[in-house]
């Protein structure tokens, strides 16, 4: 029988303690938030939040200004001098918790915990190809605003997720607070609201549509919002929330909820559970039929999705996904199962759910006992009845009101449980060529990157590396420009490109060469690397014979 | 649909004054601040002023201050803006117009001409 | 108070030309200048807000572009219903009160 060289096994074929060095900036404090700007000129900007203050960098992550925003009757604070004199409120730190950009001007929005939650909007200025912020705008008008009606308080302390969309000659922002009886009784930030930003910039339109937490239901009923994007016709919150109301708080699990984005209004506001489980493929004595439940969302991310994961969701190639990491939560008893698992929920398919759903309610015949649902927003109600009423009522459509859907989307981990141990924190996803890559920072402070495919027993990795040494979480926001990611772990925020740091911790010629092409890797010499990183031979078809 | 309706053509004495109206409809009259514009034969546009229906408060180009007063009845959606001791100076076609970035929504217009 | 002035005050072109408005801040107001057509006896139609969002609805050979305090409206492949006058628009925003530019009248060759 002929030799055969030895096969190396898969695991010696990568080292993922190789080190890489991605450029970075240290904040200063604590990063809380961050967002990028690209604009139509070339020129570009990261935006980075740490508490009492706003710092603005070029894309290679050097300072080009930075602006203090508290504390809230510090003199020295510029976002508040942009209110006129004081005071304005309780004086205090400012931590960040709303920065979006707004598109149409452009212009930046920042919202903080201080001055009632109100928001600043700083006209992008460029120069050359880097950005400064123009003086702040102060989106308050005092007159216009008082603790039980405050269409200029967005932000609240518990956290607050903002999602700008562009109708007409008009911009409205959809805002998604964490409440409680303190922060509700504090200048009434609601829980979902629709804002007309004024075109003067003077704050925002009075009269605006919300939804909130009903008082006797704050104590105990708390939402948080961990995720909001924009995509198509509609907007979409992404929650972790109590089961019930009635156990509240209790165990808890993930909705999406789905508002109109052509209309301005709350009566289409539909929410959905979506349901995350681990599958494993041989199922042990005693595991949930159906597989494990991971029902609380840590992280999400919508993208459209290459050719191959498309095939494998059974959707058509650059439809929009949504992509979650779920943990199992607090009271899910001793797990057996990895510590995350990532779901795929596609958006059209969200929506058909979401629509039979207002059939099942709405149309006849119709379903006994099928409640409208949402009983910490609106009174009880059976469908097709509004919200509180016992019958339906003549000219009222059973369609112009909120509705919880009554089914859940159910879905199974995309990565068979392969993350095993990891936490993940933080989650981006793009397409490059007809691959689907999922861009994931976790809990230890390391950045793993990894083609999304359903079929493996294996995790492909374009890379798996460290940060840095101090090992901190990396933070939940996340954001692109170009060719690269920003993460922020710690007081760093990190530049990494989409194609993965290098090539490096590929060891062997073969594992190599079987990079995806998106990474530009190929052997040189005795190492992988990019043709750049190679003086001599650099070759990406073949390997030398081994000796 | 978006549409704001004048009051018709008004011929005044020098000395007079003058009250227009535009009414609103097609959206919620409250949420958005209305602005008065003027324009005189063949000159350019000016503004005048706006006023935010949902509080009252207004504002005005300096030119215009003390020449025109701006108000809303919110119970018929309705703003006015008023003209006082009117000279021939102030012969010009108002329009209202709604706020927005650029305004997309106009009035029609009412043209005041000041005559002895 | 900021200026806006507008260049030409006038100009004659003929159907299927390209012409060019140009319109100057006194000072840098950003992205915040509308264009409108306004011919005799209607009101006035908005053509690009932001200094070059597209209305929707407008024909597509009507662009804005600028910002800070130069900006400037382009008609390509003049039409005849093009004819009228046009002008700029300092947009309301934080502070500034809206101001007109002094108008481009556009006559037919």
């Known amino acids: 029988k002929e030799w055969q060289c030895p096969r190396t096994p898969y695991a010696a074929s990568r080292d993922f303690n190789v080190k890489y060095m991605v450029p970075s900036f240290s904040a200063g404090g604590l990063v809380q938030t961050m967002v990028t700007y690209q604009g139509d000129k070339n020129e570009s900007a990261v935006f980075v939040a740490i508490r009492n203050r706003l710092h603005v960098l070029g894309p290679d992550l050097k300072s080009v200004q930075s602006l203090a925003t508290g504390p809230a009757g510090d003199p020295g604070c510029q976002t508040c001098a942009a209110c006129g004199p004081g005071p304005h409120g309780p004086s205090g730190d400012t931590d960040t918790k709303v920065l979006v950009l707004e598109p149409a001007l452009p212009a930046l929005v920042s919202c903080g915990s201080s001055l009632q939650g109100r928001c600043f909007l700083h006209d992008l200025d460029p120069q050359g190809t880097a950005v400064h912020l123009a003086a702040p705008a102060c989106l308050f008008s005092a007159h216009h605003n008082r603790p039980d009606d405050c269409p200029d308080c967005v932000a609240s302390p518990l956290g607050t997720r903002v999602t700008v969309v562009e109708q007409g000659q008009a911009s409205y922002f959809y805002v998604a607070s964490s409440l409680d009886a303190a922060v509700a009784a504090s200048f009434s930030p609601r829980s979902v609201s629709i804002r007309r930003l004024k075109a003067d910039a003077s704050g925002f339109a009075p009269g605006f549509v919300a939804l909130s937490v009903l008082p006797k239901h704050l104590v105990s009923y708390s939402i948080e919002y961990v995720h909001s994007f924009h995509t198509g016709a509609f907007v979409y919150f992404l929650t972790v929330q109590p089961a019930s109301v009635t156990d509240a708080p209790g165990a808890l699990h993930t909705r999406l909820a789905r508002l109109s984005a052509t209309e301005p209004e709350l009566g289409d506001y539909r929410e959905l559970v979506l349901d995350c489980r681990f599958a494993p493929k041989r199922r042990r004595r005693g595991a949930p039929e159906g597989g494990q439940p991971y029902p609380v969302l840590r992280v999400a991310h919508s993208a459209p999705v290459g050719a191959q994961l498309a095939t494998e969701l059974s959707i058509a190639e650059g439809q929009e996904v949504l992509f979650g990491v779920f943990v199992a939560g607090k009271d899910s008893g001793p797990g057996v199962g990895p510590n995350s698992v990532v779901c795929a929920f596609p958006i059209d398919l969200l929506d058909t759910l979401i629509d039979e759903g207002v059939e099942r309610c709405c149309e006849s015949p119709v379903h006994p006992g099928l409640r409208r649902g949402l009983d910490f927003f609106q009174s009880p109600s059976f469908c097709p009845n509004p919200p509180g009423l016992e019958a339906p009522s003549p000219n009222t459509s059973c369609r112009h009101f909120p509705l919880l859907v009554s089914s859940s989307f159910s879905r199974v981990d995309l990565f068979n449980g392969l993350l095993g141990t990891v936490e993940v924190t933080a989650l981006y996803v793009t397409r490059l060529d007809n691959v689907t890559v999922a861009h994931m920072g976790t809990a230890d402070g390391r950045i793993l990157q990894v083609e999304l495919a359903r079929s493996l027993n294996y995790l492909l990795y374009v890379s798996n590396f460290s940060l840095g040494d101090s090992g901190q979480p990396v933070q939940r926001d996340v954001s692109r420009l170009g060719d690269h990611l920003f993460f922020a772990s710690g007081d760093q925020v990190f530049q990494v490109p989409i194609q993965g740091p290098g090539c490096r911790h590929f060891l062997t010629c073969g594992r190599c060469l079987r990079a995806q092409r998106f990474m530009g890797c190929g052997w040189c010499g005795n190492m992988c690397g990019r043709q750049k990183e190679c003086p001599g031979s650099w070759q990406q078809d073949h390997c030398p014979p081994k000796l | 649909e978006v549409q704001l309706q004048q009051s018709g053509p008004e011929l005044e004495k020098p000395g007079a004054s003058v009250k227009i109206s535009c009414k609103a409809s097609?959206?919620?009259?409250?949420?958005?601040?209305m602005n008065w514009v003027k324009q005189s034969n063949g000159e350019s546009l000016e503004w005048i002023g706006d006023i935010d229906p949902y509080y009252g408060g207004t504002r005005y180009n300096q030119k215009f201050k003390g020449k025109a007063t701006l108000t809303v009845d919110k119970s018929s959606s309705t703003a006015y803006m008023q003209l006082k001791s009117l000279t021939s100076e102030d012969s010009a076609v108002y329009y209202c117009?709604?706020?927005?970035?650029?305004?997309?929504?106009w009035g029609q217009g009412t043209l005041v001409t000041v005559s002895a | 108070d900021i200026q806006m002035t507008q260049s030409p005050a006038s100009l004659s072109a003929s159907v299927g030309e390209t012409v060019t408005i140009t319109c100057r801040a006194s000072?840098?107001?950003?992205?915040?200048l509308a264009w409108y057509q306004k011919k005799q006896g209607k009101s006035p139609q908005l053509l690009v807000y932001?200094?070059?969002t597209s209305v929707e609805g407008v024909p597509s050979r009507f662009s804005g572009s600028g910002s800070g305090i130069q900006f400037s409206l382009k008609i390509n492949s003049l039409q005849p219903e093009d004819f009228g006058s046009y002008y700029c628009?300092?947009?309301?925003?934080?502070?500034?009160?809206?101001?007109f530019g002094g108008g481009t009248k556009l006559e037919i060759k």
């Open positions: 628009h300092c947009q309301h925003h934080y502070g500034t009160l809206p101001t």
């Open positions: 097609g959206y919620s009259f409250t949420g958005y601040n």
């Open positions: 000072e840098n107001i950003y992205s915040y």
């Open positions: 117009a709604r706020e927005g970035r650029g305004f997309a929504y």
């Open positions: 932001n200094a070059k």
